[in-house]
Interface confidence: low
């Protein structure tokens, strides 16, 4: 209840997160024209990326473009990119939708299509659909430890969400363990009324809200966090312009003294931790 006699102050907060879990990924791997099933293990270093601010990212799906090298090649025949003669291709032109700089030549992409040749990382990335089901769908069972330190400078009061009495093997539950700061990713989605398996395909943004409503008066002291969860991105993927959440990164290597890279389009969940609240004291 609102105590009008108290001096209220907004919370100042810092957040640190640690994700844990192992995923086994099974995917089709093509080597020398032969496609076979490949198995790989993903640990924390493979699927999490450090983000600025109160956010962390967990990769749940990906599309790879392997063995790219800087050279000349036909660009991907996306809509409107096909050509029939060199006149359609402008030397030095950088189309924002393209992956390189045009050389001015119209060349064969495959048996039936021609596109403008580009100077780029080749072969250029294909516009592939994200795999369904998601390759790292087992990320649903990963856990995240959230460390949240808060401060009310005006009241000279500091505390944190992790108590000395807390059990390191607990898992947050709204009813049974509402003060545990280790969260199962699948549970976060369940609490928000979302389907993890579905969101994992294209990615998304999930908000973890930590609300501190602190009464700092010594006679009725209370200062513990309340956790709630909600999806922050546009969930109507059919209607939204760019559905889900993804970004690209590359792994570079040398082969026969030629620099090559594997381009990875990573789909996943960005978790934004939103800390708010007030501290009141007489």
């Amino acid at each position: 209840s609102d105590k009008l006699y108290q001096r209220k102050e907004p919370v100042i907060s810092s957040v640190h997160t640690k994700v844990k879990g192992i995923a086994e990924v099974t995917e089709n791997v093509t080597e020398g024209g032969v496609t076979k099933l490949g198995h790989s293990i993903f640990d924390t270093a493979d699927y999490t990326f450090p983000l600025q601010g109160n956010s962390f990212f967990v990769m749940t799906n990906y599309v790879k473009s392997e063995g790219q090298v800087q050279t000349l090649c036909p660009e991907y025949p996306r809509r409107g990119a096909q050509c029939s003669s060199d006149r359609r291709c402008k030397k030095g032109w950088m189309d924002p939708q393209s992956k390189g700089i045009q050389t001015g030549r119209c060349v064969p992409y495959d048996k039936t299509r021609k596109t403008c040749e580009v100077s780029a990382w080749c072969p250029t990335e294909e516009e592939k659909e994200a795999p369904r089901p998601a390759l790292l769908r087992s990320a649903e069972n990963f856990t995240v430890l959230i460390k949240n330190n808060i401060h009310f400078p005006g009241h000279n009061y500091t505390t944190r969400n992790i108590l000395p009495t807390m059990n390191g093997s607990c898992t947050f539950h709204k009813t049974w363990d509402p003060q545990c700061s280790i969260f199962r990713l699948g549970d976060i989605f369940q609490e928000a009324g979302e389907n993890f398996t579905e969101v994992a395909v294209q990615g998304g943004i999930m908000g973890i809200e930590i609300y501190w409503d602190c009464n700092l008066d010594s006679w009725s002291h209370h200062c513990r966090p309340r956790y709630s969860f909600r999806r922050l991105d546009d969930k109507n993927t059919d209607e939204s312009f760019v559905p889900g959440y993804n970004f690209r990164y590359a792994k570079y290597y040398k082969e026969n003294n030629v620099e090559k890279r594997t381009l990875i389009k990573a789909f996943g969940i960005r978790f934004d931790i939103l800390v708010f609240g007030t501290g009141g004291k007489f």
Epitope: T71, L72, V107, P108, D110, K111
Partner: nanobody, 126 residues
Framework: EVQLVESGGGLVQAGGSLRLSCAAS????????VGWFRQAPGKERDFVAT????????HYLDSVKGRFTISRDNALNTVHLQMHILKPEDTALYYC???????????????????WGQGTQVTVSS
């Protein structure tokens, strides 16, 4: 490896025709795309035309489209380049090349080809 030998070059007047042939030996020829390239003195080797392994598809340099025709006969292990309405700027040493790596269906770059002939000279006088 595929061995290639070109023939059919010569001196011709502008507006005339020539038919270049490329004879191959080697088992992989019939499953390899083949291309013709040309190199004028002091210039880089340029793509002219390419034909798919099965002879179904072709690709040409824009400036030779409608004048040159590439064809192949896998039974005889030969590829031909029929050239009509020749121009002085067509003067060059013409090379036949095979792409045995299978890296592209219709390769059009020098580095995509791994077997080359010695070349045959085509001179077009005005």
């Amino acid at each position: 490896e595929v061995q290639l030998v070109e023939s059919g070059g010569g001196l011709v007047q502008a507006g005339g025709s020539l038919r270049l042939s490329c004879a191959a030996s080697g088992r992989t020829f019939s499953s390899s795309p083949v291309g013709w390239f040309r190199q004028a003195p002091g210039k880089e080797r340029d793509f002219v035309a390419t034909i798919s392994w099965n002879g179904v598809d072709t690709h040409y340099l824009d400036s030779v489209k409608g004048r040159f025709t590439i064809s192949r006969d896998n039974a005889l292990n030969t590829v031909h380049l029929q050239m009509h309405i020749l121009k002085p700027e067509d003067t060059a040493l013409y090379y036949c090349a095979a792409s045995t790596s299978g890296s592209a269906y219709l390769p059009y770059r020098v580095y995509q080809y791994d077997s080359w002939g010695q070349g045959t000279q085509v001179t077009v006088s005005s």
